[in-house]
Interface confidence: medium
């Protein structure tokens, strides 16, 4: 009994620390990846970053964080499904072509990470409000940075 009772407090402490470490670490990695991707996306304008998407942030007062991530992923998926091979977006020059290809690649990565963070199967996107893709990504970046600051503090 003596040995067990002596071992329990440090064991409990270790488990608690391990749990916090794993949770914090997971949070950091996913968010860091998302923020990094968003930074890359917002750095570079392409022919189609001025196209409009559903603005899910306009009226998101009664929406949980997970729902927001899920709906953001849905909006991004709708965008790249529509415009991946849109010749207006692909442009005429090699540079425009590759910039658009890169945009789509980043949007797919972002979509994948947001779904992982949301952990939901589906979510409705019914808003009438629109914003440009560029503004949508900037807004998402602000939300993610806020979440990261809370997560890492």
């Amino acid at each position: 009994m003596g040995l067990t009772s002596q071992l329990l407090p440090p064991l409990f402490f270790l488990l608690a620390c391990a749990g916090n470490f794993v949770h914090g670490h997971k949070c950091d990695i996913t968010l860091q990846e998302i923020i990094k991707t968003l930074n890359s996306l917002t750095e570079q304008k392409t022919l189609c970053t001025e196209l409009t998407v559903t603005d899910i942030f306009a009226a998101s007062k009664n929406t949980t964080e997970k729902e927001t991530f899920c709906r953001a992923a849905t909006v991004l998926r709708q965008f790249y499904s529509h415009h991946e091979k849109d010749t207006r977006c692909l442009g005429a020059t090699a540079q425009q072509f590759h910039r658009h290809k890169q945009l789509i690649r980043f949007l797919k990565r972002l979509d994948r990470n947001l779904w992982g963070l949301a952990g939901l199967n589906s979510c409705p996107v019914k808003e009438a409000n629109q914003s440009t893709l560029e503004n949508f990504l900037e807004r998402l970046k602000t939300i993610m940075r806020e979440k990261y600051s809370k997560c890492s503090s």
Epitope: Q95, H98, Q102
Partner: nanobody, 116 residues
Framework: EVQLLESGGGLVQPGGSLRLSCAAS????????MAWVRQAPGKGLEWVSW????????YYADFVKGRFTISRDNSKNTLYLQMNSLRAEDTAVYYC?????????WGQGTLVTVSS
């Protein structure tokens, strides 16, 4: 050393067809997306078509959609461009390009002239 050698260009009448080939060497062809890019007299470079490494994904510029077909044979390290319903405005030097994030290697080009 990366080498891309285009062939198949020539003089053709409007409405005619040509098939361009590009023999690749000096890199693992099957690992790279490939593109056809062209330069018309006195104009800048414009991309024509792009194909991914396994040939399942293709892109076409608006001006060639439905007329040109890009394909590749990874066993022969060769890229193709089948050009149908050619128009005078398709007259250009056609280059094949190795593509990974940008078109980083080019061939010497093959001239396609569409004229009656």
């Amino acid at each position: 050393e990366v080498q891309l050698l285009e062939s198949g260009g020539g003089l053709v009448q409007p409405g005619g067809s040509l098939r361009l080939s590009c023999a690749a060497s000096g890199f693992t062809f099957r690992n790279y997306g490939m593109a056809w890019v062209r330069q018309a007299p006195g104009k800048g470079l414009e991309w024509v078509s792009w194909i991914n490494s396994n040939g399942r994904e293709t892109y076409y510029a608006d001006f060639v959609k439905g007329r040109f077909t890009i394909s590749r044979d990874n066993s022969k390290n060769t890229l193709y461009l089948q050009m149908n319903s050619l128009r005078a405005e398709d007259t250009a030097v056609y280059y094949c390009a190795k593509s990974l994030g940008r078109f980083d290697y080019w061939g010497q080009g093959t001239l396609v002239t569409v004229s009656s």
